[in-house]
Interface confidence: medium
């Protein structure tokens, strides 16, 4: 019906306005409505003007697109000619009454389909339904994927590419780990992936200044060390160093009036020379205190070495050895005086004898045929040595003696000359001052070591060697090496050390083979004024230990391997060190600090006497230990 109406209208238009010319009213009758008429008539007039001769001919030739009036007029009512819609975006154009309707292709909008729809911003279809990237394009859109993802065939969803499965050798010797959109080449801790070589390379943490003091790098890791010999230990962060702190303060008060006889491990502590009138006789008076059982108190000789007198201690008793042109004698007597108490001792040359008194009571009287030292040129010249003698004397002694004596003397009076001059010398030298109070034991000040040569081989035993150690300890700091066996190649095949425990105010005891801890006894309260007793026995097959809390035989998977390392070292030659380590690398043991405190050591049934050591640091006290510092009310 509609098309019939259109045909009718077209016929009327031909008749009324082309074959005849029409005015606006006549055109109104053709269209039967104002909007179409109002739209048509001005354009109709343009067509007329264009195809009328005369005035508008030039204009028509230049501007009109129609060949004749009919086609020009017929085209006026078609709102879709010329095309008002955007060519890219329209699907069809529908002519209407003085209007047009553009039908848009999908992805376009607007009256003339001139606006692209951004499907990526459509709130009803978020991101255009794309799982990753939505790319808007004129009239359309498409989904795409980020690197490392692949588009599924629905063209919307992106799936991660598993590069590890796709290219199994992508990481070389490292482990490939797939992650969304990518992959990672993973290395064990302490290694870094090298892209060029496609392999894991050790990180040199030491070059990154990870440690406060010393750093040792090894494949896959590193270890920090602190200089224990300078009093440092590794902090809990395993990187920084902290001072080894005192856990049991000791009374280290000294007095210059007290002369310390063990200042030197080898050598004389004091040397005096007397030139007196020839009528003078030898005399020595002093107070003496020691726990040591053997050693030289003083040695006196004539200027030409022809005569000498030795006052010593043997078995805790006074011993006198003398030699001159007339006689050669050795005498021991009196009570045991190595009791840690002050004992008044006097040695006096009388006309026919030498009198030895303890606490003013005569204990020995040694006959002598003539004067002890022969005067020359009207003078009696005498040399006196405290706590030792010249080296050449050793071979002349009637009975050999270990000269080292850990003891103190005070209130001395030699050759009836008093103490004048000597005190002034001693006052200047702190090392010569003796501790005010001491106890029985050996003291390691945390600054040095003692070395022994001990043969651990036991021919009668099937094990071949054994180490049975008993330690009585009263530490003053919670960290330090108590005992170490050191090989010729600077390794430490066995060590017993103390370390501050992670739990407060307690200590752990470590047994180590080289730099591996083979056993840790945890959380013992060792920093107390009471001594702690530790025992351990080790041979190539077993390790047994007893502490105040338990006795046990240690066994774990790795122990036999570690004991094999120890066995190999014991079959060679080992040196025994007490109180610390010699110059071995920091990394040779888990602990390298010196032990600080009192300690008595028994190895294979023999009580070690520090006076018998091959070498000993001068500050180690062989037979005296400072008392625990007691807090007084006014201190």
């Amino acid at each position: 019906a509609n098309s019939l109406l259109e045909e009718t209208k077209q016929g009327n238009l031909e008749r009324e306005c082309i074959e005849e010319l029409c005015n606006k009213e006549e055109a109104r009758e053709v269209f039967e409505n104002d909007p179409e008429t109002d739209y048509f008539y001005p354009k109709y007039l343009v067509c007329l003007r264009s195809f009328q001769t005369g005035l508008f001919t030039a204009a028509r030739q230049s501007t009109n697109a129609y060949p004749d009036l009919r086609s020009c007029v017929n085209a006026i009512p078609d709102q879709c000619s010329p095309l008002p819609c955007n060519e890219d975006g329209y699907m069809s154009c529908k002519d209407g009454k003085a209007s047009f309707t553009c039908t848009c292709k999908p992805g376009w909008q607007g009256e003339k389909c001139e606006f692209d729809i951004n499907e990526c911003k459509d709130p009803s279809n978020i991101n255009g339904g794309c799982s990753q990237i939505c790319d808007n394009t004129p009239g359309s859109y498409h989904c795409s994927c980020k690197n490392g993802f692949v588009m599924l065939s629905n063209k919307k969803d992106c799936k991660d590419v598993d590069e590890c499965s796709l290219k199994p050798s992508i990481c070389g010797t490292a482990v490939c780990k797939n992650i969304p959109g990518d992959f990672e080449c993973e290395c064990p801790e302490g290694y870094r992936y090298n892209l060029k070589s496609k392999s894991c390379e050790d990180i040199d943490e030491c070059s990154e200044n990870m440690c406060a003091q010393l750093c040792v790098n090894y494949p896959g890791g590193y270890t920090c060390y602190c200089d224990g010999k300078k009093g440092f230990k590794l902090a809990q962060d395993q990187k920084s160093c902290e001072v080894v702190s005192v856990c049991l303060p000791l009374n280290l008060d000294t007095k210059y009036e007290l002369l310390y006889l063990a200042e030197q491990f080898a050598g004389v502590v004091l040397y005096l020379k007397f030139r007196l009138p020839e009528i003078s006789r030898f005399s020595a008076e002093f107070d003496f205190r020691t726990y040591d059982s053997e050693g030289v108190i003083l040695y006196a000789e004539s200027i030409d070495h022809s005569a000498w007198l030795l006052i010593a201690l043997r078995g805790g008793k006074i011993e006198v050895q003398l030699k001159n042109e007339h006689t050669s004698k050795i005498t021991t007597g009196g009570d045991v005086i190595n009791n840690g108490l002050w004992n008044m001792v006097s040695v006096e040359e009388l006309e026919h004898s030498i009198s030895i008194k303890i606490a003013k009571e005569a204990v020995m009287d040694i006959n002598k045929p003539g004067p002890l030292f022969k005067p020359e040129n009207g003078l009696l010249e005498t040399k006196v040595y405290f706590a030792g003698f010249p080296r050449k004397v050793e071979s002349e002694l009637i009975k050999p003696i270990n000269p080292r004596l850990d003891g103190c003397i005070r209130s001395w009076n030699l050759m009836k000359q008093g103490a004048s001059g000597i005190k002034e010398i001693i006052q200047e030298k702190q090392n010569k001052h003796c501790l005010v109070t001491v106890e029985k034991g050996s003291y390691y000040p945390g600054s040095g070591i003692a070395q022994f040569h001990i043969d651990y081989n036991n021919v009668s035993s099937a094990e071949g060697w054994h180490v049975n150690v008993t330690l009585n300890i009263r530490p003053s700091t919670g960290t330090g090496v108590m005992l170490a066996l050191v090989s010729g190649n600077n390794t430490v095949p066995f060590a017993v050390s103390l370390v501050d425990s992670t739990s407060e105010k307690s200590q752990d005891i470590l047994l180590s083979v080289e730099n591996t801890v083979i056993y840790r006894i945890q959380a013992l309260s060792l920093c107390s004024d009471q001594q702690s007793h530790l025992e351990f026995r080790v041979n190539r097959n077993n390790l047994e230990l007893s502490t105040p809390l338990k006795i046990e035989t240690i066994s774990h998977e790795d122990l036999q391997r570690q004991l094999a390392v120890l066995d190999k070292a014991m079959k060679a030659k080992v040196a025994t060190y007490l109180g610390g380590l010699p110059d071995v690398p920091f990394s040779a043991t888990p602990v390298n600090a010196f032990y600080n405190g009192c300690m008595e050591v028994n190895i294979n049934g023999v009580q070690l006497d520090l006076d018998e050591a091959i070498s000993k640091h001068n500050d180690i006290r062989a037979h005296s230990c400072p008392s625990v510092w007691k807090k007084t009310k006014n201190s």
Partner: antibody, heavy 119, light 106 residues
Framework: EVKLEESGGGLVQPGGSMKLSCAAS????????MGWVRQSPEKGLEWVAE??????????YYSESVKGRFTISRDDSKSSVYLQMNSLRAEDTGIFYC??????????WGQGTTLTVSS | QIVLTQSPAIMSASPGEKVTMTCSGR?????MYWYQQKPGSPPRLWIY???NLVSGVPARFSGSRSGTSYSLTISSMEAEDAATYYC?????????FGGGTKLEIR
């Protein structure tokens, strides 16, 4: 739109041979990884074979149960993938699906073709 | 070869009910894929990379992992969800599928 259409199924005697075809359209076939998956009530879904695209030199992979008996091939000019099955056994019976494989998952499946191995 | 064990083998749920099915393997390193299959039709990819829904899959579906156990969950069961669901993993050849969980509507 992706389309996969299998053909070539039917009844075959044990020990016999059969060739399945799969015609593909709606995607760039030469780059695609294609595969065959079969389904039976006894074994459920079971991957059979895979052939990779041109970029991967048409590398082929097989499940242990068919290795040496089945051969997967393709003709990129015809956008088709094939499965030549020899020495067939009763346990090979099932619906064989042609699949488009994307990054190790079975992205698109055909409707399937049924193979029956029976005497 | 990884063996994927799906449980339960068969389950039923009422409309609106929450449904969870699991798939256990040996590896927690790889992605899990889930397929939905309705009778007479081939399986359709449903969830990929463990938890991503394929375009067009209703948001009531979700996927997750806990250790070596993977789950497919429907927050509120609908009649159209009745189907068999298969899990699949690739951890090097061969590709492996689970035995399936058949979900029925009560």
């Amino acid at each position: 739109e992706v389309k996969l259409e299998e053909s070539g199924g039917g009844l075959v005697q044990p020990g016999g041979s059969m060739k399945l075809s799969c015609a593909a359209s709606g995607f760039t076939f030469s780059d695609a990884w294609m595969g065959w998956v079969r389904q039976s009530p006894e074994k459920g879904l079971e991957w059979v074979a895979e052939i990779r695209g041109k970029a991967n030199n048409h590398a082929t992979y097989y499940s242990e149960s068919v290795k040496g008996r089945f051969t997967i091939s393709r003709d990129d000019s015809k956008s088709s993938v094939y499965l030549q099955m020899n020495s067939l056994r009763a346990e090979d019976t099932g619906i064989f699906y042609c699949c488009l494989i994307t990054a190790f998952l079975f992205d698109y499946w055909g409707q399937g073709t049924t193979l029956t191995v029976s005497s | 070869q990884i063996v994927l064990t799906q449980s339960p083998a068969i389950m039923s749920a009422s409309p609106g009910e929450k449904v969870t099915m699991t798939c256990s393997g040996r590896s927690s390193e790889n992605y899990m894929y889930w397929y939905q299959q309705k009778p007479g039709s081939p399986p359709r990819l449903w969830i990929y990379d463990t938890s991503n829904l394929v375009s067009g899959v209703p948001a009531r579906f979700s996927g997750s992992r806990s250790g070596t156990s993977y789950s497919l969950t429907i927050s509120s069961m609908e009649a159209e969800d009745a189907a068999t669901y298969y899990c699949q993993q690739f951890n090097g050849y061969p590709y492996t599928f689970g035995g399936g969980t058949k979900l029925e509507i009560r």
